[in-house]
């Protein structure tokens, strides 16, 4: 996409990691069939993808979760793709919502988010969910990535 | 994205095809509003997209299916994006799962998968589903593609 | 992706806008964290993205909606990504369908569409849904965009 030293390809694809933390921010790892093109994009603290160069990026996330209507809150399961730019508040870029299933013990559903956004140097993107304990971490079910246009 | 003879654009978008085969691998065709940029990506045996050049690719698939909880197995409908690299076993890149609907005769649902992956020359990607007979083949419902970064 | 004056980056990401119109075509706005790379892609009449240059584009849309099986028609909620090329009829590029939820008052669900398509100069893409009144317009829930390869 970007050729030569001036324009190296910048892309990442990271894999979900189960976490004992109670935070709503999903955890990721460079494991399995992951992608990390170079040090112009990095996975920081296992939770956010941080870019060194300004530009337009296609950013995506996929979250598979298993929930049950009776065992969950009334509110739907929501996955949010969020941005933290240097010196700025965090903001939501994309969200998706799925009502809980009536299947027992739980019903699996998958959410896909993706869009083109301008990122500043040092900007980080991360994924937030309403209930991380419901997220499926089996091979390929939950992942997160970006590519620089 | 890639300009000049050295760096031609490489992209494909193929359309689902109903199949009498009992295989779980979905069938595709170059029909309708399809894309096949050049011979650096090919649709082989109507089932896999094969690339000639090594590099990073954004690969995606969309599957719409119609199923009913009572008529289906307990297991959810799962769509898998799989990779076959030369000399290596097939492996799962991405998966999405949706529990069957209680709607009658069946309830439609759509799954979208997408991610950035490194492919070797001669690598093939294909889409596997738990029950191909449930897949919807109406215009635009089920498709598969890639683009080289 | 495309560097220099000859090959400027072309990308857009627009945000859903509630509309009093009864049309099934969704309305969009350049608001919030939107992207409009330059005048080689424009949002026309708040409803379609129009490109000036021929080429391959990755086009995507995400639609979140809230519906209830009893209050809705029997037919599922369908989102369609459509193309209008100069001098040609409109055509469907991609569709996704989700059966209505049994949750009350309504159950939220998200749809994601995306694919690589050849666009002619002056071609426009837009998003159609079966019931625009069910679409969710909260931050990040419903968006539409493209990028030129």
């Amino acid at each position: 996409m970007q050729k030569g030293d001036q324009n190296p390809q910048i892309a990442a694809h990271v894999i979900s990691e189960a976490s004992s933390k109670t935070t709503s921010v999903l955890q990721w790892a460079e494991k399995g069939y992951y992608t990390m093109s170079n040090n112009l994009v990095t996975l920081e603290n296992g939770k956010q993808l941080t870019v060194k160069r300004q530009g337009l990026y296609y950013i995506y996330a996929q979250v598979t979760f298993c929930s049950n209507r009776e065992a969950s809150s009334q509110a739907p399961f929501i996955a949010s793709l969020c941005l933290k730019s240097p010196g700025r508040f965090e903001r939501i870029l994309l969200r998706a919502a799925n009502t809980h299933s009536s299947a027992k013990p739980c019903g699996q559903q998958s959410i896909h988010l993706g869009g083109v956004f301008e990122l500043q140097p040092g900007a980080s993107v991360f994924v937030n969910v309403t209930d991380p304990s419901q997220v499926s971490h089996g091979t390929g079910f939950t992942s997160f990535g970006l590519l620089k246009l | 994205m890639q300009k000049g003879d050295q760096n031609p654009q490489i992209a494909a978008h193929v359309i689902s095809e109903a199949s009498s085969k009992t295989t779980s691998v979905l069938q595709w065709a170059e029909k309708g509003y399809y894309t096949m940029s050049n011979n650096l990506v090919t649709l082989e045996n109507g089932k896999q997209l094969t690339v000639k050049r090594q590099g990073l690719y954004y690969i995606y698939a969309q599957v719409t299916f119609c199923s009913n909880r009572e008529a289906s197995s307990q297991a959810p409908f799962i769509a898998s994006l799989c990779l076959k690299s030369p000399g290596r076993f097939e492996r799962i890149l991405l998966r999405a799962a949706n529990t069957h609907s209680s709607a009658k005769p069946c309830g439609q649902q759509s799954i979208h998968l997408g991610g950035v992956f490194e492919l070797q020359p001669g690598a093939s990607v294909f889409v596997n589903v738990t029950d191909p007979s449930q897949v919807s083949h109406g215009t635009g419902f089920t498709s598969f593609g890639l683009l080289k970064l | 992706m495309q560097k220099g004056d000859q090959n400027p980056q072309i990308a857009a990401h627009v945000i859903s806008e509630a509309s009093s119109k009864t049309t099934s075509v969704l309305q969009w706005a350049e608001k919030g964290y939107y992207t409009m790379s330059n005048n080689l892609v424009t949002l026309e009449n708040g409803k379609q993205l129009t490109v000036k240059r021929q080429g391959l584009y990755y086009i995507y849309a995400q639609v979140t909606f809230c519906s209830n099986r009893e209050a809705s028609s029997q037919a599922p909620f369908i989102a369609s990504l459509c193309l209008k090329s100069p001098g040609r009829f409109e055509r469907i590029l991609l569709r996704a369908a989700n059966t209505h939820s049994s949750a009350k008052p309504c159950g939220q669900q998200s749809i994601h569409l995306g694919g690589v398509f050849e666009l002619q100069p002056g071609a426009s893409v837009f998003v159609n849904v079966t019931d625009p009144s069910q679409v969710s317009h909260g931050t990040g829930f419903t968006s539409f965009g493209l990028l030129k390869l």
Epitope: - | S24, V25, S80, C82, P86, G87, F89, G122, N128 | -
Partner: antibody
Framework: QVQLVQSGAEVQKPGSSVKVSCKAS????????FNWVRQVPGQGLEWMGR????????SYAQKFQDRVTITADKSTSTAYMELSSLRSEDTAMYYC???????????WGQGTLVTVSS | DIQMTQSPSSLSASVGDRVTITCRAS??????LAWYQQKPEKAPKSLIY???SLQSGVPSRFSGSGSGTDFTLTISSLQPEDFATYYC?????????FGGGTKVEIK
């Protein structure tokens, strides 16, 4: 130690089907693929197809595509090959072979002789 | 399909001889090539995988080389138990294909 034990010799009539089994021991079944190779008397080796039990994906040689079905039962660590519409030319020794990811066929079964005769 | 051509189809050699068998693929297969030994009325046995890696338990007199389209199996010093038929096989892509075999006989 690794062993692939195949079912016994079969005599079948033309037009019928045969199902040969291959029970694996001495390794995690799902970590491998299981291939079927046949050898007509006095001739070379011919690959028929294989199954990857972990993903339940079977692949076949075009020549056998319409007649062969390869399956695996993870609970018993057994791979199966069923060949239908048998003809006299299918008289051969049928071998199963375990495949390592990236490493070819490391172990072979003892073979099952299938004779097709009216 | 990828065709595998083995040569020679047969050869006669004496104990202690250095024996070389070649295998050519009709298109590039990187290093995804295996060699097997088969004795009469027996199942094949794996010797070499990934063109040059020796299968566990196989004597070091056997070696493999090559990549792309041209491959070689070498037996540095032929032993009495090495008289057999040898097959190359590509597992680069489906359908996996074997060479026609090389029969090594006692001179």
């Amino acid at each position: 130690q690794v062993q692939l034990v195949q079912s016994g010799a079969e005599v079948q009539k033309p037009g019928s089907s045969v199902k040969v089994s291959c029970k694996a021991s001495g390794g995690t079944f799902s970590n491998f693929a299981f291939n079927w190779v046949r050898q007509v008397p006095g001739q070379g080796l011919e690959w028929m197809g294989r199954i990857l039990p972990s993903l339940d994906i079977a692949s076949y040689a075009q020549k056998f595509q319409d007649r062969v079905t390869i399956t695996a039962d993870k609970s018993t660590s057994t791979a199966y090959m069923e060949l239908s519409s048998l003809r006299s030319e299918d008289t051969a020794m049928y071998y199963c072979a375990r495949e390592v990811d990236g490493g070819g066929f490391d172990y072979w079964g003892q073979g099952t002789l299938v004779t097709v005769s009216s | 399909d990828i065709q595998m051509t083995q040569s020679p189809s047969s050869l006669s050699a004496s104990v202690g001889d250095r024996v070389t068998i070649t295998c050519r693929a009709s298109q590039g297969i990187s290093s995804w090539l295996a060699w097997y030994q088969q004795k009469p009325e027996k199942a094949p046995k794996s010797l070499i995988y990934a063109a040059s890696s020796l299968q566990s338990g196989v004597p070091s007199r056997f070696s493999g080389s090559g990549s792309g389209t041209d491959f070689t199996l070498t037996i540095s010093s032929l032993q009495p138990e090495d008289f057999a038929t040898y097959y190359c096989q590509q597992y680069n892509s489906y359908p996996f294909t074997f060479g026609g075999g090389t029969k090594v006989e006692i001179k």
